[in-house]
């Protein structure tokens, strides 16, 4: 969490941002909130990016003002116009690119004063794994598959019964480049699995950690998958 203040005493306002991550090819949110004002027409929001000459986005007098927007953000940005009045200056970024990573500044002017806060935005690719029983194999195996990751993640298997066991000798992981030549499909196979056990396939890079669990018993099969972004720190 980054909390920024304006420069001059009583003319400063609090602006708060949250470091976040964007999934390339999808839409992302750059979070920013501020002390709200009564009149929308008195609020100015400017989003800037370090190293970029033009503005990322500007909103003033109740509408977008994009005459000074940098070309790299043309047609890809929007604020939540109906939420600006309650202090939400978050920016929606369409079709996130690897090059969108960097330091952004959320700069706010209201009738109460000015304020700004920086935000670190990471970009990459992350997806939830599917873990399935592979009955085609000679011995019972599990196959963990996740369609899009970047940068290349690590893959680790774990088991509820054999806690702390190292499965690297009985697993095989491969990374296959996807058609857009950036992200990769992750496939990991675990051999010699036993029944009445829960296995977890954990995929992690510096942006996200995803886990796929599977529990196989005589009477049921239970699957779970979840994902956590690793760098959601507020400023």
């Amino acid at each position: 969490l980054i909390i920024g203040f304006g420069i001059s005493g009583r003319h400063s306002i609090t602006v708060t941002t949250v470091a976040s991550a964007g999934n390339i090819g999808e839409d992302g949110i750059l979070s920013c909130t501020f002390e709200p004002d009564i009149k929308l027409s008195d609020i100015v929001i400017q989003w800037l990016k370090e190293g970029v000459l033009g503005l990322v986005h500007e909103f003033k007098e109740g509408k977008d003002e994009l005459s000074e927007q940098d070309e790299m953000f043309r047609g890809r940005t929007a604020v939540f116009a109906d939420q600006v009045i309650v202090g939400n200056a978050s920016l929606r970024l369409k079709n996130v690119q690897l090059t969108d990573a960097g330091t952004y500044k959320c700069y706010i002017i209201t009738s109460k004063g000015k304020g700004n806060a920086n935000l670190e935005y990471k970009t990459g690719a992350f997806s939830m794994p599917e873990v399935n029983v592979d009955y085609n194999a000679s011995s019972e195996t599990l196959r963990c598959e996740a369609p899009r990751w970047f940068p290349q993640p690590t893959v680790v298997w774990a088991s509820q019964v054999d806690q702390g066991a190292n499965f690297s000798e009985v697993s095989n992981t491969s990374f296959e480049l996807n058609s857009e030549n950036v992200t990769m499909k992750v496939v990991s196979v675990l051999y010699n699995v036993t029944i009445n056990n829960t296995y977890s396939c954990m995929i992690e890079n510096d942006i996200a950690k995803a886990t796929g669990d599977i529990k196989v018993t005589e009477s049921e099969i239970k699957r779970r998958s979840h994902l956590q972004l690793l760098n959601s720190k507020a400023s």
């Epitope: 599917e130 196959r143 998958s225 994902l227």
Partner: antibody
Framework: QVQLQESGPGLVKPSQTLSLTCTVS??????????WSWIRQHPGKGLEWIGN???????YYNPSLKSRVTISVDTSKNQFSLKLNSVTAADTAVYYC??????????????????????WGQGTTVTVSS | DIQLTQSPSFLSASVGDRVTITCWAS??????LAWYQQKPGKAPKLLIY???TLQSGVPSRFSGSGSGTEFTLTISSLQPEDFATYYC?????????FGGGTKVEIK
């Protein structure tokens, strides 16, 4: 969104094998995150899950039918199939093919996948009778 | 297998009524429950997944709640097109099972 269409004989003799095919359009059967399912509904009754298959070939079956069921996938034809052998009159039902899909939901710690049967075929009636 | 019990099996209601259908699971299933609507001669249609998440395109008069073993589907103001049979389904583990259904009829 994918569309599904069931096909196969509407009448099967007792003790024979019921064979149905589901053709997938507006999407690839090789897409990750989808499980290709069969569900049936006996006349005037509720729904019964038969089983499903992932594009890689992993299958999951209802234990009550497991000994008689085979679900297979043909990625080249964008189709998946159901075979149910040794049929009796009790297998008379409307058979639906459907997609079981992982839908990500926001949780306090990130995201969690919730599976749900979100797209269904129109259904095909199969009668078992001599 | 996880058994799902729906109540009531039949329900007579009028347009504008608030309708509540309950689904009980034989064991805890967290929020792994979906609700479907089925009209005669048609395939079921997904209304709600993850117990309370409204499927895209489904009217906001439909809502779901519950966790663990007890779940409810509520229609806040019944419309003519809502007269149908409603099913709950757990997605906690395989085999998936459905509730027996609740038929909502015009009073």
């Amino acid at each position: 969104q994918v569309q599904l269409q069931e096909s196969g004989p509407g009448l099967v003799k007792p003790s024979q094998t019921l064979s149905l095919t589901c053709t997938v359009s507006d999407g690839s059967i090789s897409s990750g995150g989808y499980y290709w399912s069969w569900i049936r509904q006996h006349p005037g009754k509720g729904l019964e899950w038969i089983g499903n298959i992932y594009y890689s070939g992993s299958t999951y079956y209802n234990p009550s039918l497991k000994s008689r069921v085979t679900i297979s996938v043909d990625t080249s034809k964008n189709q998946f199939s159901l075979k149910l052998n040794s049929v009796t009159a009790a297998d008379t039902a409307v058979y639906y093919c459907a997609t079981e899909k992982a839908l990500a939901t926001v949780t306090p710690s990130g995201y969690e996948n919730y599976y749900t049967v979100d797209v269904w075929g129109q259904g095909t009636t199969v009668t078992v009778s001599s | 297998d996880i058994q799902l019990t729906q109540s009531p099996s039949f329900l007579s209601a009028s347009v504008g009524d608030r309708v509540t259908i309950t689904c009980w699971a034989s064991q805890g299933i967290s929020s792994y429950l979906a609700w479907y609507q089925q009209k005669p001669g048609k395939a079921p249609k997904l209304l709600i997944y993850a117990a309370s998440t409204l499927q895209s395109g489904v009217p906001s008069r439909f809502s779901g709640s519950g966790s663990g073993t007890e779940f409810t589907l509520t229609i806040s103001s019944l419309q003519p097109e809502d007269f149908a049979t409603y099913y709950c389904q757990h997605l906690n583990s395989y085999p998936l099972t459905f509730g027996g259904g609740t038929k909502v009829e015009i009073k």
